[in-house]
C-alpha cells in the first residue's frame, strides 16, 4: 500500500476579519494509526491550532466527524478571524508512539491572509487656537487594517489639500497596519464654518471610503475689530457712547469701559448676533453724565477676547463743547447689532 500523504489542496485562503476560515486537509490512508494536529508556522516554536484529542480550542470546529472509523477528512474551521490569525497553517499526521506521539507527515501548508477594515479615521487639530493667516497642523489616524495598501486624502470644504505627509506602519510584514498623516492648513477669517476631512480608502471598504472630520471652529480664533462712536444727545447733560465689537470668534469675550483710565463697568458678551460666516458681533453702550466732569473725558472700550491680551479703542469726549454727534472712528461695514443699554 502507498505511504500516507497529507493533502492541503489550498495554497492560500483569503478571509475577511470576523468571518470563518476553512482550512482543508485530507489523508490518503488510515495507516499509520495516530492523530492529526494543526499548527501555525513551522519549527519548534510552532503554535498548536488544533489537536483532535487534547487541549482547548474554542474557535475551532472540524468539518467532519473525526471519530468515524474511516474518516480521512481533517479539515477545520476557525471562527471569528482577526488579522492576528494570518500565517501558514500545517496539517500534520502523527504516529502513535511512546511516550509521545511522533510526527509522521505534514501537509504543504495553507497561507491564511486576513482582510481587515481600517478603523474610523480620527482627526485631531492643534491644542491651542490660532488666528487667520496662520498655518495649523491636523493629524489623522486609522488602525488595524490589512493588507497594507491604503490611500489617504485630505479635504478642506470639499477641496483636496496637497500639503500633507503620510506614514504607514510598520514598514515590514505585520498582521495589521496603521496609518498616520499630518496636513497643514492655512486659516482664513471665513473658516469658522469650515471642515477638514480625512478620507481613507482600502480594499475592504468596497469603494466606500471612511471619513474623519474636524471642525475649524474648534481651531480658529478670529480677533474682533472695535469701533467706538458717540450717539446723539439723549438729555442735556448725558452722552451715549457705543463700542461695536465686530467679527469675532469664539464668543468668549469680556468688555471693560474706562473713563480717564478708571474702570467704569465690565460686562461679558451674552446676547450676540451671528454673521453668515459664523463670527459674532456685539455692541455695548455707555451713558456718560457730562455734568459730573469738569474736563474732557477719555473713554476707552477695552476687550479681552478668548483669554488673549486686551485690545482697546478710545474716544475723546469734549466737555467744553455742546455735546453734538461726533465719532472718532469710521465704521468699516454696516452690520446689524444687538443694542444693549446699560446705565
Amino acid at each position: 500500500e502507498e505511504e500516507l500523504q497529507v493533502i492541503q489542496p489550498d495554497k492560500s485562503v483569503l478571509v475577511a476579519a470576523g468571518e470563518t476560515a476553512t482550512l482543508r486537509c485530507t489523508a490518503t490512508s488510515l495507516i499509520p494509526v495516530g492523530p492529526i494536529q494543526w499548527f501555525r508556522g513551522a519549527g519548534p516554536g510552532r503554535e498548536l491550532i488544533y489537536n483532535q484529542k487534547e487541549g482547548h480550542f474554542p474557535r475551532v470546529t472540524t468539518v467532519s466527524d473525526l471519530t468515524k472509523r474511516n474518516n480521512m477528512d481533517f479539515s477545520i474551521r476557525i471562527g471569528n478571524i482577526t488579522p492576528a490569525d494570518a500565517g501558514t497553517y500545517y496539517c500534520v499526521k502523527f504516529r502513535k508512539g511512546s511516550p509521545d506521539d511522533v510526527e509522521f507527515k505534514s501537509g504543504a501548508g495553507t497561507e491564511l491572509s486576513v482582510r481587515a477594515k481600517p478603523s474610523a479615521p480620527v482627526v485631531s487639530g492643534p491644542a491651542a487656537r490660532a488666528t487667520p493667516q496662520h498655518t495649523v497642523s491636523f493629524t489623522c489616524e486609522s488602525h488595524g487594517f490589512s493588507p497594507r495598501d491604503i490611500t489617504l486624502k485630505w479635504f478642506k470644504n470639499g477641496n483636496e489639500l496637497s500639503d500633507f505627509q503620510t506614514n504607514v506602519d510598520p514598514v515590514g510584514e505585520s498582521v495589521s497596519y496603521s496609518i498616520h498623516s499630518t496636513a497643514k492648513v492655512v486659516l482664513t477669517r471665513e473658516d469658522v464654518h469650515s471642515q477638514v476631512i480625512c478620507e481613507v480608502a482600502h480594499v475592504t471598504l468596497q469603494g466606500d471610503p471612511l471619513r474623519g472630520t474636524a471642525n475649524l471652529s474648534e481651531t480658529i480664533r478670529v480677533p474682533p475689530t472695535l469701533e467706538v462712536t458717540q450717539q446723539p444727545v439723549r438729555a442735556e447733560n448725558q452722552v451715549n457712547v457705543t463700542c461695536q465689537v465686530r467679527k469675532f470668534y469664539p464668543q468668549r469675550l469680556q468688555l471693560t469701559w474706562l473713563e480717564n483710565g478708571n474702570v467704569s463697568r465690565t460686562e461679558t458678551a451674552s446676547t450676540v448676533t451671528e454673521n453668515k460666516d459664523g463670527t459674532y458681533n456685539w455692541m455695548s453702550w455707555l451713558l456718560v453724565n457730562v455734568s459730573a466732569h469738569r474736563d474732557d473725558v477719555k473713554l476707552t472700550c477695552q476687550v479681552e477676547h478668548d483669554g488673549q491680551p486686551a485690545v482697546s479703542k478710545s474716544h475723546d469726549l469734549k466737555v467744553s463743547a455742546h455735546p453734538k454727534e461726533q465719532g472718532s472712528n469710521t465704521a468699516a461695514e454696516n452690520t446689524g447689532s444687538n443694542e444693549r443699554n446699560i446705565y
Partner: antibody, heavy 114, light 108 residues
Framework: QVQLVQSGAEVKKPGASVKVSCKAS????????IHWVRQAPGQGLEWMGR????????KHNPKFHDRVTMTRDTSTSTVYMELSSLRSEDTAVYYC???????WGQGTTVTVSS | EIVLTQSPATLSLSPGERATLSCRAS???????LYWYQQKPGQAPRLLIY???NLASGIPARFSGSGSGTDFTLTISSLEPEDFAVYYC?????????FGGGTKVEIK
C-alpha cells in the same frame, strides 16, 4: 450539557485495589482523551494518566509503574481507573477530566487505611 | 519529565491589589500547551487560561496570562473576594503531563 459523573467515595485497606468510574454525557465519548488527576489532602494536583476512549490507548505517569490501569466501556460511555497495591499515600481525591481540560468530574475520595 | 515550579507558594494580599503568580518550567514549553487553573476548597479545578494567554469562557478580564519558553505568569489585575484560592499551572507539551505545586492567594 457536558457532564462527567464519578462513582462514590471508597475506603480501602493497604494492599487492596480500587476502581473508580467516570461516566460521560453531553458530548461524543470518543472525541477526546479522558485524564485522571489526583489530589492528596492539602497537596497539589498530580497527573496519573489518560485513555483514548476511541481505541483504548493509554499513557500513564511512570511514577505509578504498573499500579494504574485505565479502561473504557463505549456502550455506557464510561471510563475506569483502577489503582492496585494501595498504600496510605494513595489517600486522595481522584478526578477524571475531559481532554479539553474544561470539563472535570466532581471527584472521588479514596481513603486507604488499615 | 518537565517540572513546573510555582512561586510564591503563598501570596497574602488585600482585595483590590494586583496579584502576580509565576510558573517556571525545567525545560522549554511551547505556549500553546501551558494552562492555568483556579481551585477552591472542595471543588474541582477550573480552567482559567489556555495557551498561556487566552482567557477561558466565562473568566473575568481581570485575569491575564503571559510568557513563553520557561517563564510564565498569571496576573490578577485587581483582586476580588472570590479570587482567593489556589492557582496551578499545567503543561501538556510532553508526557507525563505535569502540574506546578500551586500558589495559594490568601486574604491579608
Amino acid at each position: 450539557q457536558v457532564q462527567l459523573v464519578q462513582s462514590g467515595a471508597e475506603v480501602k485497606k493497604p494492599g487492596a485495589s480500587v476502581k473508580v468510574s467516570c461516566k460521560a454525557s453531553g458530548f461524543n465519548f470518543e472525541d477526546t482523551y479522558i485524564h485522571w488527576v489526583r489530589q492528596a489532602p492539602g497537596q497539589g494536583l498530580e497527573w496519573m494518566g489518560r485513555i483514548d476512549p476511541a481505541d483504548g490507548d493509554t499513557k500513564h505517569n511512570p511514577k505509578f509503574h504498573d499500579r494504574v490501569t485505565m479502561t473504557r466501556d463505549t456502550s455506557t460511555s464510561t471510563v475506569y481507573m483502577e489503582l492496585s497495591s494501595l498504600r496510605s499515600e494513595d489517600t486522595a481525591v481522584y478526578y477524571c477530566a475531559r481532554g479539553n481540560y474544561v470539563n472535570w468530574g466532581q471527584g472521588t475520595t479514596v481513603t486507604v487505611s488499615s | 519529565e518537565i517540572v513546573l515550579t510555582q512561586s510564591p507558594a503563598t501570596l497574602s494580599l488585600s482585595p483590590g491589589e494586583r496579584a502576580t503568580l509565576s510558573c517556571r518550567a525545567s525545560s522549554s514549553v511551547t505556549s500553546s500547551y501551558l494552562y492555568w487553573y483556579q481551585q477552591k476548597p472542595g471543588q474541582a479545578p477550573r480552567l482559567l487560561i489556555y495557551s498561556a494567554s487566552n482567557l477561558a469562557s466565562g473568566i473575568p478580564a481581570r485575569f491575564s496570562g503571559s510568557g513563553s519558553g520557561t517563564d510564565f505568569t498569571l496576573t490578577i489585575s485587581s483582586l476580588e473576594p472570590e479570587d482567593f484560592a489556589v492557582y496551578y499551572c499545567h503543561q501538556w507539551y510532553s508526557y507525563p503531563r505535569t502540574f506546578g505545586g500551586g500558589t495559594k492567594v490568601e486574604i491579608k
